[in-house]
Structure formats: C-alpha cells, structure tokens
C-alpha cells in the first residue's frame, strides 16, 4: 500500500519545508486515494473481463452511485463554492457504504482497499473543517446502508464483480471532479 500523505520520504528529508496548507493537504489526500483506486482497479481488471464489458450500462442503472451534475456547482460553468463543497462531502459520505462493500472483494489488495476506505474518512474530516454550511450536509441512514450492503452481497458472483468495477470507476470519476473543483476554491 502507498504511504499515507505526510509520511513519504521527501517529508522526512526536508524538515524545513513549509507545513502543508489545508488545501494542499486535501489535494494530496485525494491524489493518494486515487492511487489506491488505480491499484484496486488493476486487480479487478486482471481478475475478470469487467473492464471491457458491454453490460455496464445495465448494471449501472441498479447502483445509485453519487455523481456530479450541473446543479451541484462543481463545474466551471455555474461554479458555486458552497454548494459544491456540500455536494463533495455528501457524495463522499454516500460512497462510504460502497467502500465498506469493497472491503472483502479483494484478495491480493486487501490492505489497499482498507487504505482507500480509511483515507476517505480522513478526507471527509478535512473537508468538514473547511465547510461552513454543515447543516446542509445529510448523513446516510445506517439502517438503509445495512440493507444496501446485504442487497449488494446477495448478488451472484458476476454481478458482484461488475458492482466492484462500477464502484471503483464511479469513485475515481467523483474524486477527479472533486479535485478539479477544490483547486478553484
């Protein structure tokens, strides 16, 4: 697993470097999670042919994965810092149940899956400190999440492999959009 942000050898070698700003820390955290997702996607694509499957659209309709839309204010046109930040935090909170689902889906990258999950929790904390309008952020209902987890695990092997692939792909896209938006804040 990659070394978490702030613990790499460069930081040790440069003790006089300025401490990271809040925005730099968030940026670095997202890039770290994206590296982890790449490693997990590699295992998924090697293990099955999901990455070339034409049945993605069918399966994707059955997963209510967070997605950036124009109204969320995260795109260059119609950019709105506060609305966008709320969307990023809400989306990450919604992704948590899917990251929990991923925990038992990997053989050789088990630690990597755990690292992505824990780093996302840390990222949410960073972003919550940055957000002023925390009242607008809705936390997913634990009972609903438990039900969703069971439903995902009730699928057959092929559907679970497809679900894993779609979660990783959607989470990567969501984080990339978030990274671009946060760099404008």
């Amino acid at each position: 697993a990659p070394v978490p942000p702030g613990e790499d050898s460069k930081d040790v070698a440069a003790p006089h470097r300025q401490p990271l700003t809040s925005s730099e820390r968030i940026d670095k955290q997202i890039r770290y999670i994206l590296d982890g997702i790449s490693a997990l996607r590699k295992e998924t694509c090697n293990k099955s042919n999901m990455c070339e499957s034409s049945k993605e659209a069918l399966a994707e309709n059955n997963l209510n994965l967070p997605k950036m839309a124009e109204k969320d204010g995260c795109f260059q046109s119609g950019f709105n810092e506060e609305t966008c930040l709320v969307k990023i935090i809400t989306g990450l909170l919604e992704f948590e149940v899917y990251l929990e689902y991923l925990q038992n889906r990997f053989e050789s990258s088990e630690e990597q899956a755990r690292a992505v999950q824990m780093s996302t929790k840390v990222l949410i904390q960073f972003l919550q400190k940055k957000a002023k309008n925390l009242d607008a952020i809705t936390t997913p209902d634990p009972t609903t999440n438990a039900s969703l987890l069971t439903k995902l695990q009730a699928q057959n092997q092929w559907l679970q492999d497809m679900t894993t692939h779609l979660i990783l792909r959607s989470f990567k896209e969501f984080l990339q959009s978030s990274l671009r938006a946060l760099r404008q804040m």
Epitope: N62, A146, T150, K151, Q153, A154, L159
Partner: antibody, heavy 115, light 110 residues
Framework: CQSVEESGGRLVTPGTPLTLTCTVS????????MSWVRQAPGKGLEWIGI?????TTYYATWAKGRFTISKTSTTVDLRITSPTTEDTATYFC???????????WGQGTLVTVSS | AQVLTQTPSPVSAAVGGTVTINCQAS????????LGWYQQKRGQPPKYLIY???TLASGVPSRFKGSGSGTQFTLTISDLECDDAATYYC??????????FGGGTEVVVK
C-alpha cells in the same frame, strides 16, 4: 470449487428446537449473503430468510419469530424455534438472494416434525 | 406480502416445440430486474438458469430465454428436449431484502 452443504436435519417432536447448519467452502461468508429456503414434500420452494456478509438478517413475514439465522466465519445456522408438523420439509441453503443471487445450492437436509 | 404468480401449470409441448411460462409480481421487483428462473428435477436442488430477468447463467443453453421488467416476466424454452421436463420457478427480490418464489410450473415434454 465453491460449494455449500446442509446438515442437522432429523426427526423431532413438535416444540423441540432444532438447529440446521450450512457449511460453505471456496468462498467467503464476509463477501456473500446467504439464504435459507425450504420445500415441503411435493410442494414449491419457500424463502425463509437471508443473512448479509456483515451479519444483518431479513426474514419472510411468515418466518419472523419462528426462525433465527446466525453465522460464524464458515457456517450459517438456521434455528427452528418451536417446530410444528407444518415445518416438515427439505431445507436448502443457497448463496445470495433468490433471483439475482441463489447461484449455488446445497443438496438440502430433511427435517421431519412428528409426534 | 410480496407474491409471484406463475402461469400456467402444468404446461406441455412436444419435443422440438416451445413453451412459455409467465411470472407476475404483486409489486415491482428491486431495480425492476431482480428476477431469476430456476429448474428443479425431483429429488434435486434447484438449478440456476437466468438472472437479472434475461441473463443466462453460466453453462445454460441459449434455448432458454428470459424477458420482462418491473412486474411482468416470461421464461421461454424453445427446441424442447426430453431433459427439459422439470418444474420451473421464478424468484424475485424486493425492496428491503425480501425475496420470494413463484408457485412453480411443471413442464411436461411429450
């Protein structure tokens, strides 16, 4: 090779609690939900309940209070709280939820409830 | 309670013929496609045929075809073989992780 096997079926008298066990191999119970299904002699399939990889349970309306599903790392148990003659059936364990799951089944274990 | 109603039962056709089995849900199945079909022969556990309403399970011949969404589903078996004689069940998943089977349809091959 992925497989499931039921055990524990036997002749019991009405009211005597009975626990059936489903032993899995070749896959992890933390990744898959598991269902219990029964079939009375000459009748159709009847879904009893399901337990998720994280231990959450859901039951058919008619089965609530009559059955309890629990699990360990390699087994899933079905406890028949207070069997009646109507519970005489072959009990199957299946991986996942019937429909989009239910891809691997055991051979079943026969429970006979009689006085 | 969630109910799946299968019709007709029994159904019979000659070798090489076609049979169609219908399955109607009392409410929409989860994601409109959480529905599968199983084949069961006497003394055996059910065999997985179709999932997601229309996707063939591994090793199932293309003579078996599933269709439908929401509340109405169909299993069609074409080019009937003697070995297709069995009871067929539809099974659906509903909101809140509740599952159900249809009553079963016996297929007789003449």
């Amino acid at each position: 090779c992925q497989s499931v096997e039921e055990s524990g079926g036997r002749l019991v008298t009405p009211g005597t609690p009975l626990t059936l066990t489903c032993t899995v191999s070749g896959f992890s119970l933390s990744s898959y939900a598991m269902s219990w299904v029964r079939q009375a002699p000459g009748k159709g399939l009847e879904w009893i309940g399901i337990i998720g990889g994280f231990g959450t349970t859901y039951y058919a309306t008619w089965a609530k209070g009559r059955f309890t599903i629990s699990k360990t790392s390699t087994t899933v148990d079905l406890r028949i709280t207070s069997p009646t003659t109507e519970d005489t059936a072959t009990y199957f364990c299946a991986r996942g939820g019937p429909g989009n799951g239910g891809d691997i089944w055991g051979q079943g274990t026969l429970v006979t409830v009689s006085s | 309670a969630q109910v799946l109603t299968q019709t007709p039962s029994p159904v019979s056709a000659a070798v090489g013929g076609t049979v169609t089995i219908n399955c109607q849900a009392s409410q929409s199945v989860d994601d409109n496609n959480w529905l599968g079909w199983y084949q069961q022969k006497r003394g055996q556990p059910p065999k997985y045929l179709i999932y997601s309403a229309s996707t063939l399970a591994s090793g199932v011949p293309s003579r078996f075809k599933g269709s439908g969404s929401g509340t109405q589903f169909t299993l069609t078996i074409s080019d009937l073989e003697c070995d297709d004689a069995a009871t067929y069940y539809c099974a659906g998943g509903f909101s809140g992780n509740i599952f159900a089977f249809g009553g079963g349809t016996e297929v007789v091959v003449k």
